[in-house]
């Protein structure tokens, strides 16, 4: 008789999840020799321990503490790039600007990027059929709690000038409900962070509007200012040219506005 299984509204655990996490950990330590002290088997065990045999709507930040401890990493606190709804460009940027880091350039972010996972209460099985959706099912699911935890820690570590890349093509350029808007903004430390600089990325080729004047950007400025952090904003009119100029800053066409 097949055992009854909870049907959630979201996609199930990514196939080959355990193998992918372990492989990514090994890759990360190969690429980043300063993280060679990390035992990838222990990392996987801690990751698994955070959600296996637990109800997938009852996950807490505490569940992830053993993993957080194993994945402790020091990144230059003044070289942090946050992003919202524009992950690919942010990652393309840090691939070129090697001294800057997104959350996914850290071990824990790299391990979980684009993956979904959940377990079931009282069984050691991973649920490959379905996992809770943040909106339709519950917010305290394994994936959401993981990203909330690592995002908070990442924002808390930031100092000096923190950059954030925002998608100027979205109706809400700054969205209070995004991870950036709901977690990272509120966990920047005013005693360490001097300025939050927003880069608003334009989508349209002919879009010459000043999106820094957008009402949602003004809302972000207000939230940040109330937290005693300065705010600045730049339009990136040509993201392709922007990346090209990061690669080749001496190019003559890079002196004009991008």
């Amino acid at each position: 008789v097949p055992r009854w299984r909870q049907q959630w509204s979201g996609p199930g655990t990514t196939k080959r999840f355990p193998e992918t996490v372990l492989a990514r950990c090994v890759k990360y330590t190969e690429i980043h020799p300063e993280m060679r002290h990390v035992d990838c088997q222990s990392v996987w065990d801690a990751f698994k321990g955070a959600f296996i045999s637990k109800h997938p709507c009852n996950i807490t930040e505490e569940d992830y503490q053993p993993l957080m401890k194993l994945g402790t990493q020091t990144v230059p606190c003044n070289k942090i790039l946050l992003w919202s709804r524009i992950k690919d460009l942010a990652h393309q940027f840090t691939q070129v600007q090697r001294d800057m880091f997104t959350l996914e350039d850290t071990l824990l972010g790299y391990l979980a990027d684009d993956l979904t996972w959940c377990g079931e209460f009282n069984t050691s099985k991973i649920n490959y059929q379905s996992c809770p959706d943040w909106r339709k099912d519950c917010s305290n699911n394994p994936v959401s709690v993981f990203w909330k935890t690592v995002s908070r820690r990442f924002a808390e570590a930031a100092c000096d000038v923190v950059h954030v890349m925002l998608n100027g093509s979205r109706s809400k350029i700054f969205d209070k409900n995004s991870t950036f808007g709901s977690v990272e903004v509120h966990n920047l430390q005013p005693e360490k962070v001097q300025t939050l600089e927003a880069w608003v990325i334009h989508g349209g080729r002919e879009d010459s509007r000043d999106l820094c004047q957008d009402p949602t950007i003004k809302e972000l400025e207000s939230i940040i200012s109330k937290r005693n952090i300065q705010f600045s904003c730049k339009n990136i009119y040509r993201p392709d040219k922007f990346l090209q100029c990061v690669k080749n800053p001496e190019d003559s066409s890079c002196t004009s506005e991008i």
Partner: antibody, heavy 120, light 107 residues
Amino acid sequence: EVQLVQSGAEVKKPGATVKISCKVSGYTFTDSVMNWVQQAPGKGLEWMGWIDPEYGRTDVAEKFQGRVTITADTSTDTAYMELSSLRSEDTAVYYCARTGYNSGYGFPYWGQGTTVTVSS
Amino acid sequence: DIQMTQSPSSLSASVGDRVTITCKASQNVDSDVDWYQQKPGKAPKLLIYKASNRYTGVPSRFSGSGSGTDFTFTISSLQPEDIATYYCMQSNTHPRTFGGGTKVEIK
């Protein structure tokens, strides 16, 4: 069984570009970093760079920066190394290589090598 | 970049002899040194990883030791099939760097 199979020998003129492929089998391509190593005739081994096929992230040794492009095609499980502005000193055997799970950070897996001859 | 100075560049020994090759790193590389054997026209073959660990299937006559900056590779009893060039490589820091190689011949 893990296998790395490289494309055949190439003869190129100075200034040209060569693109070498490394097709893998026996493991999940995106699970490992792919490295490239150069060996000039009668010379030692020189690490050129790596690619993480899952994300397309690369790192290239300073000596080769600006001339080497490393790419990966996850649909065909193939890594590529392109070397441009060829000169005679680029005449060498080029290898793709990867680490294993029980080999620290050494390279237990190598392609058979691709000989590139640069001659006018 | 870390320099790996390997010596000797070549040696000649008799079958059954003990052969020792050394590699000196220009800075501390912990135990992140690997040793490779390469025969003419073939790809290098991993023998020793992390200074002293024999890779799967490698005969017990091959061994390695050392940490920090000084590393040693030993063939306890040289066999005819061991004629090859041997390389050390540091895998501690990018870029990975190799020693210049030691060509081993039979007397």
